[in-house]
C-alpha cells in the first residue's frame, strides 16, 4: 500500500511527587516501521529511561504505537518527541501550561 504518515499526539499525565509522565502517540500510519523516541535538550534519551508500546494494527489497515518517559514538572520545554517514518521526520514539543494535548499530521 501507499505511505500514510502518522498522526502524532503528545500528552502529559497528572503530577506525582514532582514528576509527570509524557506520552507520545503515533497513529494511523503505514508501513509499520517507525522511529519514535524522546529527546532532552536535543539529545536522545537512553532506552532504559523510556517505555514503548508495541506497534499494533488499528483496524483500518494502519498502525499505532507510543513511547513514554517520566520528567520533572517544570522541565517540559526541554523535551521533544522525535518521529521518523518513511523518509520523513518531525519533532513534537510537550504541551506547556494548561494545554495537555498537542497533535499534528505529517504530510
Amino acid at each position: 500500500g501507499s505511505t500514510v504518515p502518522p498522526m502524532v499526539n503528545v500528552t502529559c499525565s497528572e503530577v506525582s511527587e514532582g514528576n509527570i509522565t509524557v506520552t507520545c502517540r503515533a497513529s494511523s500510519f503505514y508501513p509499520r516501521n517507525i522511529t519514535l523516541t524522546w529527546r532532552q535538550d536535543g539529545v536522545s534519551l537512553s532506552h532504559n529511561t523510556q517505555q514503548w508500546g508495541d506497534v499494533l494494527p488499528d483496524g483500518n489497515g494502519t498502525y499505532q504505537t507510543w513511547v513514554a518517559t517520566r520528567i520533572r514538572q517544570g522541565e517540559e520545554q526541554r523535551f521533544t518527541c522525535y518521529m521518523e517514518h518513511s523518509g520523513n521526520h518531525g519533532t513534537h514539543p510537550v504541551p506547556s501550561g494548561n494545554s495537555h494535548h498537542h497533535h499534528h499530521h505529517h504530510h
Partner: antibody, heavy 120, light 107 residues
Amino acid sequence: QVQLKESGPGLVAPSQSLSITCTVSGFSLNGQGVNWVRQPPGKGLEWLGMIWGDGSTDYNSALKSRLSISKDNSRSQVFLKMNSLQTDDTARYYCARGAHYGKRWYFDVWGAGTTVTVSS
Amino acid sequence: DIQMTQTTSSLSASLGDRVTISCSASQNINNYLNWYQQKPHGTVKLLIYYTSSLPSGVPSRFSGSGSGTDYSLTISNLEPEDIASYYCQQYSKLPPTFGGGTKVEIK
C-alpha cells in the same frame, strides 16, 4: 539495495583534523540515522556518534569535544570530522545505518570501512 | 558508560560443533543487546538484535538469549563461513558500547 561507502585520507599527521565521507544509496538520509564506529588495529569496536534524519546529532561524550557529524541529504552523504588527532586515533572507521524501531535499535548495514593512520 | 565484557577472546571448535559465546554487562541492560559478526577482512554484519531476534538472511543456526546482565550467542552447527569475530553491543544507555569480541577459529 542499501549500501554505504566510506572515503577518507588514509594518512593524517598528529594534531591535524580528519574528514571522512560516507556516501549512501538505497535509502533516504532524510528519514534514517547514520552512525560512525571505529576499530583500532587488533581491538574492538567503538561508537563515535550518529546523525538522525532531521540532522540532529548524538555523540560519544568521551569524544564529543573533537567530533562533528553533518550531512548533505541531496548528495546522500554523511560527514565525520575529528580534530586534534593523535596516534591512538589510528583505526578503521565505519559508517553504519541505524534502524530504530521502538525497543529495537541496531546497525543493520555497514560500510566496508576506511583505514586512517595517524603518523608524522 | 556501560562496560560489555566478552571473557573469551578466542576459541577453537570443529565444524559441526555447537559454539556458545558469552557477554556480560556491567549493569542490567533490559535485553537491549545486539550481536555483530566481523569477517577476517573486516566486513561487519548484524547477526542478532534485541537479544534474540534474527534479521532476514541470517541462518537459523544462529540464536541469541539472555536477560539482565548476562547474554549469549549460540551457533548450533559451526560452518566454515562462521569463522569470524563476534561482538555484543548494548544500547540500553548512550553511548552504545561493544564487547571486546570473540574470535572463532576452526580446530
